[in-house]
């Protein structure tokens, strides 16, 4: 969490941002809140990006003002216009690109004063893994697949029964480049599994950590998946 304060002159106002991550090819949100003002027409929101000459987005007098917007953000940004009055300056970002990563500044002017806060935005690809029993294999085998990751993640297998066991010798992981030549499909196979056990396939890079669990018994198979973004720090 980053909390910024205003500059001298007028009074300063508190602006708060949260570091976040965007999934490339999907839509993202850059979070920013501020001390609200009672009059929408008095609120100016500017989003800036380090190293970019034009603005990322500007909202003033109750509407978007995009004449100074940088070309790389054209048609891709919006604030939640109906929530600005309650202090939400968060930015929607369409079709997140790798090049959108960097340091952003959320700069606010209201009748109470000015304030800003920086936000670190990471970009990559992350997706939920699915673990299945591979019935085509010669021995009891599990197959963990996740369609989109970038940068290349690590894959670690774990089991509830054999806690602390190292499965690297009995697993094989491959990474297949997807058609857009950036993200990769992750496939990891675990051999010699035993029934009445819960296995976890954990995929992690510097942006996200995802886990796919499978419990195999003689009567049923239960699955569960979980994905968690890393380094969400508020400022």
């Amino acid at each position: 969490l980053i909390i910024g304060f205003g500059i001298s002159g007028r009074h300063s106002i508190t602006v708060t941002t949260v570091a976040s991550a965007g999934n490339i090819g999907e839509d993202g949100i850059l979070s920013c809140t501020f001390e609200p003002d009672i009059k929408l027409s008095d609120i100016v929101i500017q989003w800036l990006k380090e190293g970019v000459i034009g603005l990322v987005h500007e909202f003033k007098e109750g509407k978007d003002e995009l004449s100074e917007q940088d070309e790389m953000f054209r048609g891709r940004t919006a604030v939640f216009a109906d929530q600005v009055i309650v202090g939400n300056a968060s930015l929607r970002l369409k079709n997140v690109q790798l090049t959108d990563a960097g340091t952003y500044k959320c700069y606010i002017i209201t009748s109470k004063g000015k304030g800003n806060a920086n936000l670190e935005y990471k970009t990559g690809a992350f997706s939920m893994p699915e673990v299945n029993v591979d019935y085509n294999a010669s021995s009891e085998t599990l197959r963990c697949e996740a369609p989109r990751w970038f940068p290349q993640p690590t894959v670690v297998w774990a089991s509830q029964v054999d806690q602390g066991a190292n499965f690297s010798e009995v697993s094989n992981t491959s990474f297949e480049l997807n058609s857009e030549n950036v993200t990769m499909k992750v496939v990891s196979v675990l051999y010699n599994v035993t029934i009445n056990n819960t296995y976890s396939c954990m995929i992690e890079n510097d942006i996200a950590k995802a886990t796919g669990d499978i419990k195999v018994t003689e009567s049923e198979i239960k699955r569960r998946s979980h994905l968690q973004l890393l380094n969400s720090k508020a400022s």
Epitope: D64, L66, N95
Partner: antibody, heavy 119, light 107 residues
Framework: QVQLQESGPGLVKPSETLSLTCTVS????????WSWIRQPPGKGLEWIGY???????NNNPSLKSRVTISVDTSKNQFSLKLISVTAADTAVYYC?????????????WGQGTLVTVSS | EIVMTQSPATLSVSPGERATLSCRAS??????LAWYQQKPGQAPRLLIY???TRATGIPARFSGSGSGTEFTLTIRSLQSEDFAVYYC?????????FGGGTKLEIK
């Protein structure tokens, strides 16, 4: 109520330049993006390009560099120029307003003007 | 560019029935999709944006759903004025592209 009206010649000779103007009434041309879209007879829709009141533009690469879109805020108008036309450019040409900067649907349209390319 | 494919090309449905129109994108467009209705001799009319949000003045019988690559426009209890051509359009990436259209005709 915002209204858009296309104007320009209905017949253009091959290799010449197609020129159309869209006049916006009932609202300011400022604060919105504006687009040209065309529809060959009996076929589907093709986006040509957009302009913002500040003059920033983007065109469909399929039309290569044949397209120029310009704006005149004092007249509340924007214009399309398409050079080196061929019969394949025969279409109904629409001007339209982009709903907002994020949701690029087109919420207001002109009635369309048929431009025929023929000698 | 992102290719939008609509199916079926023609759909025959009786008035009062439900119509389901499909649109598929060649790659994910998230929820950045619009639907239009076009009647002969008229300009298209925006029905849906953001894949599921009805535009101003559009009756509740029109609904949109889907995200990623698969989208559906559903018209329940078809009225006589609903028979027209319907187009989907993606605005996830440049250039903006439209589907080839589905003609909804009276059965």
């Amino acid at each position: 109520q915002v209204q858009l009206q296309e104007s320009g010649p209905g017949l253009v000779k091959p290799s010449e330049t197609l020129s159309l103007t869209c006049t916006v009434s009932g609202g300011s041309i400022s604060s919105y993006y504006w687009s040209w879209i065309r529809q060959p007879p009996g076929k589907g829709l093709e986006w040509i390009g957009y302009i913002y009141y500040s003059g920033s533009t983007n065109n469909n690469p399929s039309l290569k560099s044949r397209v120029t879109i310009s704006v005149d805020t004092s007249k509340n108008q924007f214009s399309l120029k398409l050079i080196s036309v061929t019969a394949a450019d025969t279409a109904v040409y629409y001007c339209a307003r982009v709903y907002n900067n994020y949701d690029w649907g087109f919420d207001y349209w002109g009635q369309g003007t048929l431009v025929t390319v023929s000698s | 560019e992102i290719v939008m494919t609509q199916s079926p090309a023609t759909l025959s449905v009786s008035p009062g029935e439900r119509a389901t129109l499909s649109c598929r994108a060649s790659q994910s467009v998230s929820s950045n999709l619009a639907w239009y209705q076009q009647k002969p001799g008229q300009a298209p009319r925006l029905l849906i944006y953001g894949a599921s949000t009805r535009a101003t003045g559009i009756p509740a019988r029109f609904s949109g759903s889907g995200s990623g690559t698969e989208f559906t426009l559903t018209i329940r209890s078809l009225q006589s004025e609903d028979f027209a051509v319907y187009y989907c359009q993606q605005y996830h990436n440049w250039p903006l592209t439209f589907g080839g259209g589905t003609k909804l005709e009276i059965k």
